[in-house]
């Protein structure tokens, strides 16, 4: 007569995270009396998953009614699978015994592999802004995926980047994995509207990769170019000097006028115009009463952009040809004017 056999027909089972795993097991006999138990792993450290005899196993349901007479199907379903459930599951027949049931025969085991989707990639850029022609690093991270095989690509405005390094951790076997990649990007003056994209492809995503983005507007600083020009005389003793601040980003900018090195007026860029490339232009003017000056006047437009050291541009105003007028103002209010490039 043949002794009871425990049959686990599936060598492996693959389940997506969040779904239900069915682990199949049948016995060839009702003899001996005693429960079936399911374990994850083997040896003394094995984890009890289900015991037909006793206990509470809220995630486990039996496929068939084990109270039914002549039942020899001991298959179970485990709900809400997570990567932590991965492992080899054994269906084990015990023989009723005192004081404890005795292990009688084990099935060959079923390896449960869990397919888990990667988390949405998170792209982060440098802590400080950088200027065009500089190389900056972006990192991309995604976690919690299984199996380990994964593909990561970097793009800048749709163009694939090649200068990046990627690591998948851990190197050995694990219930789930993480990916970390660092890409190097050379900034250009046109990058205010640019995007860096990290794209992750995994078997669980069915060909629809996940993307994480970073806007270079949060990384780039485009310093302004300055031009100071003298406008035609508006009145007999007045000269209009303009300072055109072009192609800067971000908008945070403070402009100071100096007359012969002395501060005349300070103002903050407000009504700016935006260029197609995302940079800004701004213009400030100074109305100089030349009759108040005996000598030539050196006018300086000094700009402090985004907390960086000030840049300036000067203009020499010739006053020798103009008669002097005592006590008159040397500067008039500026009225904002804009120029679009």
């Amino acid at each position: 007569e043949e002794e009871l056999q425990v049959i686990q027909p599936d060598k492996s089972v693959l389940v997506a995270a969040g779904e239900t795993a069915t682990l199949r097991c049948t016995a060839t006999s009702l003899i001996p009396v005693g429960p079936i138990q399911w374990f994850r792993g083997a040896g003394p450290g094995r984890e009890l998953i289900y015991n037909q005899k006793e206990g509470h196993f809220p995630r486990v349901t039996t496929v068939s009614d084990l109270t039914k007479r002549n039942n020899m199907d001991f298959s179970i379903r485990i709900g809400n699978i997570t990567p932590a459930d991965a492992g080899t599951y054994y269906c084990v027949k015990f023989r009723k015994g005192s004081p404890d049931d005795v292990e009688f025969k084990s099935g060959a085991g079923t390896e449960l592999s869990v397919r888990a989707k990667p988390s949405a990639p998170v792209v982060s850029g440098p802590a400080a802004r950088a200027t065009p022609q500089h190389t900056v690093s972006f990192t991309c991270e995604s976690h919690g995926f299984s199996p380990r095989d994964i593909t990561l690509k970097w793009f800048k405005n749709g163009n694939e980047l090649s200068d990046f390094q990627t690591n998948v951790d851990p190197v050995g076997e694990s219930v789930s994995y993480s990916i970390h990649s660092t890409a190097k990007v050379v900034l250009t003056r046109e990058d205010v509207h640019s995007q860096v994209i990290c794209e992750v492809a995994h078997v669980t995503l069915q060909g629809d990769p996940l993307r994480g983005t970073a806007n270079l507007s949060e990384t780039i600083r485009v310093p302004p170019t300055l031009e100071v020009t003298q406008q035609p005389v508006r009145a007999e003793n007045q000269v209009n000097v303009t300072c055109q601040v072009r192609k800067f980003y971000p908008q945070r900018l403070q402009l100071t006028w100096l007359e012969n090195g002395n501060v005349s007026r300070t103002e903050t860029a407000s009504t700016v115009t935006e260029n197609k490339d995302g940079t800004y232009n701004w213009m400030s003017w100074l109305l100089v009463n030349v009759s108040a000056h005996r000598d030539d006047v050196k006018l300086t437009c000094q700009v402090e952009h985004d907390g960086q050291p000030a840049v300036s541009k000067s203009h020499d105003l010739k006053v020798s040809a103009h008669p002097k007028e005592q006590g008159s103002n040397t500067a008039a209010e500026n009225t904002g004017s804009n120029e679009r490039n």
């Epitope: 006999s29 003899i31 009396v33 007479r69 020899m72 009723k96």
Partner: antibody, heavy 115, light 111 residues
């Protein structure tokens, strides 16, 4: 589906008897066969269960004098050193208890131990 | 060995009555549910009614029900029928596979 016992009868004290339990309609290979007896006018008494070769067990009082065996179609109970108090109707039943209860029973065979 | 004590040993009841028979084990039965109930009529073999303390055997009328766990168990016949007059036995299993013991029986007679 039924079990049919045979082999009962009159036996002298100290004698031996072999009871048979033939299954029809199902195989015994995946089932235990248990033996239960009932003395005249008394209650039921569990004797033991015959499973596969190594899985055979008996109530403490029956060990040594009662031994069982089975094929895929017939189970046997060998009884030795019989005593007057062994007089009873002997039943075979399919099952091993717990989740494998005694669901099919034979009609019983009377064993009388008397000189 | 496990000892099963049934009560009452006999009872008289009428058709339509609700009948309750109890069975007490000297120790917890195996798995807290290794308890079956059998019905036996004169000159016949026993018949399985309930197993695993509360599972109704195939073909058994639903007026029979079993309950209990550990050491105390009950067989209830919700509405006694003429064919239910018989002797009822509980069978309890201890932790050892050979430790199976019947109660002494409860005879249900017509009042």
């Amino acid at each position: 589906r039924q079990l049919v016992e045979s082999g009962g009868g009159l036996v002298q004290p100290g004698g031996s008897l072999r009871l048979s339990c033939a299954a029809s309609g199902f195989s015994l290979s995946s089932h235990g066969i248990s033996w239960v007896r009932q003395a005249p006018g008394k209650g039921l008494e569990y004797i033991g269960t015959i499973g596969t070769g190594v899985i055979t067990y008996y109530a403490s009082w029956a060990k040594g004098r009662f031994t069982g065996s089975k094929t895929s179609s017939t189970a046997y109970l060998q009884m030795t050193s019989l005593r007057a108090e062994d007089t009873a109707v002997y039943y075979c039943a399919r099952g091993s208890a717990w989740n494998d209860p005694f669901d099919y029973w034979g009609q019983g065979t009377l064993v009388t131990v008397s000189s | 060995d496990i000892v099963m004590t049934q009560s009452p040993s006999s009872l008289s009841a009428s058709v339509g009555d609700r009948v309750t028979i109890t069975c007490q084990a000297s120790q917890s039965v195996y798995g807290n549910n290794d308890l079956a109930w059998y019905q036996q009529k004169p000159g016949q073999a026993p018949k399985l009614l309930i197993y695993l303390a509360s599972t109704l055997a195939t073909g058994v009328p639903s007026r029979f029900s079993g309950s209990g766990s550990g050491t105390d168990f009950t067989l209830t016949i919700s509405s006694l029928q003429p064919e239910d007059f018989a002797t009822y036995y509980c069978l309890g299993g201890g932790d050892d596979e050979a430790d199976n013991t019947f109660g002494q029986g409860t005879k249900v007679e017509i009042k």
